[in-house]
């Protein structure tokens, strides 16, 4: 049997509750010797690859995809894969953005505290952090569409 | 984009059996999960296991644990070998693949089903 | 081990009428839940996926939605075609827990 690879995980700073026009960058992590991270949304078919990846520790590597500017089509589950030659990994659990209109309360917080879905967390039913199952994403400039992998 | 299952026979209780699931039109490279179910005469589905074409990842039914081995054996096939097999393994077998443009891994494309007969 | 306990069993109902099967997880799996019919002779097909999202070509009468690990799988406006067994399934597949499970079915019958 072939060597299974770790999945990888994601998680999203400043969180996964993001007033509207604000930033969030994704991060994703997996094993060291990844070639290219992939954020998903929703499905294989609307993604967004880079080879930007760097090391997070001696056993890890990670990459960040940031959007400048949150719309409400951005809201929706987000999972990463990576290809570590010869082969592309499992998913990660989907992590779920929520994009709010900002209120403008002095009280009310802008985001959730930083979320991540990994493959040692369980599903989680909270609306804002699906940890096990799930997934949508990026805008246009974003996040594109493709029938192929690679 | 299609699957299709092969090997299903009429075998006696004890012995062994591999089943083959061919696919087409699409690329293990992807990363798919191809999954076993079966369903034995007038009873309902129930999951075996599934193989992540790409990276090597099986996952199994408890039940299924050690009688049967899903394995990735080239570019287009699977198999679910199936060992000491009884009466109550009468099934047709479905190989099944998630879906390639809908989240959370749903069985999208299914084989017709190959029949697997148990009996002296 | 997870488990999907569905119901009813079996059901009738009359051309026009509205159906509506519950699928309850044993413990929590977000929305790795899907939804297949099922008719004699033939292989699944694929009805709602990600547990409230419509697969292609399907009916908007097949609706599903969630609550907590309760998921439920309405049909409206019946017809004579619905005839069929209906199947929840589990479709993450990991070490966190093992998915993949399927409900026990439910029969509909038309009449």
């Known amino acids: 049997q072939e060597e299974d690879l770790p999945r990888p995980s994601i998680s999203a700073e400043p969180g996964t509750v993001i007033p509207l026009g604000s930033h969030v960058t994704f991060v994703c992590r997996g094993p060291v010797g990844v070639q290219t991270f992939r954020l998903e949304r929703e499905s294989r078919s609307t993604y967004n690859d880079t080879e930007d990846v760097s090391q997070a520790s001696p056993s890890e590597s990670e990459a960040r995809f940031r959007i400048d500017s949150v719309s409400e089509g951005n809201a929706g589950p987000y999972r990463c894969i990576y290809y570590k030659p010869p082969k592309w990994s499992e998913q990660s659990d989907y992590l779920e953005l929520l994009v709010k209109e900002t209120s403008g309360g002095p009280d009310s917080p802008d985001t959730e505290p930083g979320s991540s879905a990994g493959p040692t967390q369980r599903p989680s039913d909270n609306s804002h952090n699906e940890h096990a199952p799930a997934s949508q994403g990026l805008k246009a400039e974003h996040l594109y569409h493709h029938h192929h992998h690679h | 984009q299609s699957v299709k299952e092969s090997g299903g026979d009429l075998v006696k209780p004890g012995a062994s059996l591999t089943l083959a699931c061919t696919a087409s039109?699409?690329?293990?490279?992807?990363?798919?999960?191809m999954c076993w179910v079966r369903q034995a005469p007038g009873k309902g589905l129930e999951w075996i296991g599934c193989?992540?074409?790409?990276?090597?990842?099986i996952y199994y039914a408890s039940w299924a644990k050690g009688r049967f081995t899903i394995s990735k054996t080239s570019s287009t096939m699977v198999t679910l070998q199936m060992s000491s097999l009884t009466a109550a393994d009468t099934a047709t077998y479905f190989c099944?693949?998630?879906?390639?443009?809908?989240?959370?891994?749903?069985?999208?494309?299914w084989g017709p089903g190959t029949l697997v007969t148990i009996s002296s | 081990e997870l488990d999907l306990t569905q119901t009813p069993a079996s059901v009738s109902e009359a051309v026009g009428g509205t159906v509506t099967i519950k699928c309850q997880a044993s413990?929590?799996?977000?929305?790795?839940l899907a939804w297949y019919q099922q008719k004699p002779g033939q292989r699944p097909k694929l009805l709602i996926y990600?547990?409230?999202s419509l697969a292609s070509g399907v009916s908007s009468r097949f609706r599903g939605s969630r609550s907590g690990t309760e998921y439920t799988l309405t049909i409206t406006d019946l017809e004579c075609d619905d005839a069929a067994t209906y199947y929840c399934?589990?479709?993450?597949?990991?070490?966190?827990?093992?998915?993949?499970?399927f409900g026990g079915g439910t029969e509909l019958e038309i009449k």
């Open positions: 193989i992540h074409s790409s990276s090597g990842s």
């Open positions: 413990q929590t799996i977000s929305n790795y």
């Open positions: 399934q589990c479709t993450y597949y990991g070490t966190t827990y093992v998915g993949g499970a």
């Open positions: 099944a693949r998630d879906s390639e443009s809908y989240g959370y891994n749903p069985c999208e494309l």
């Open positions: 039109g699409f690329s293990f490279s992807d990363g798919y999960y």
């Open positions: 990600a547990a409230s």
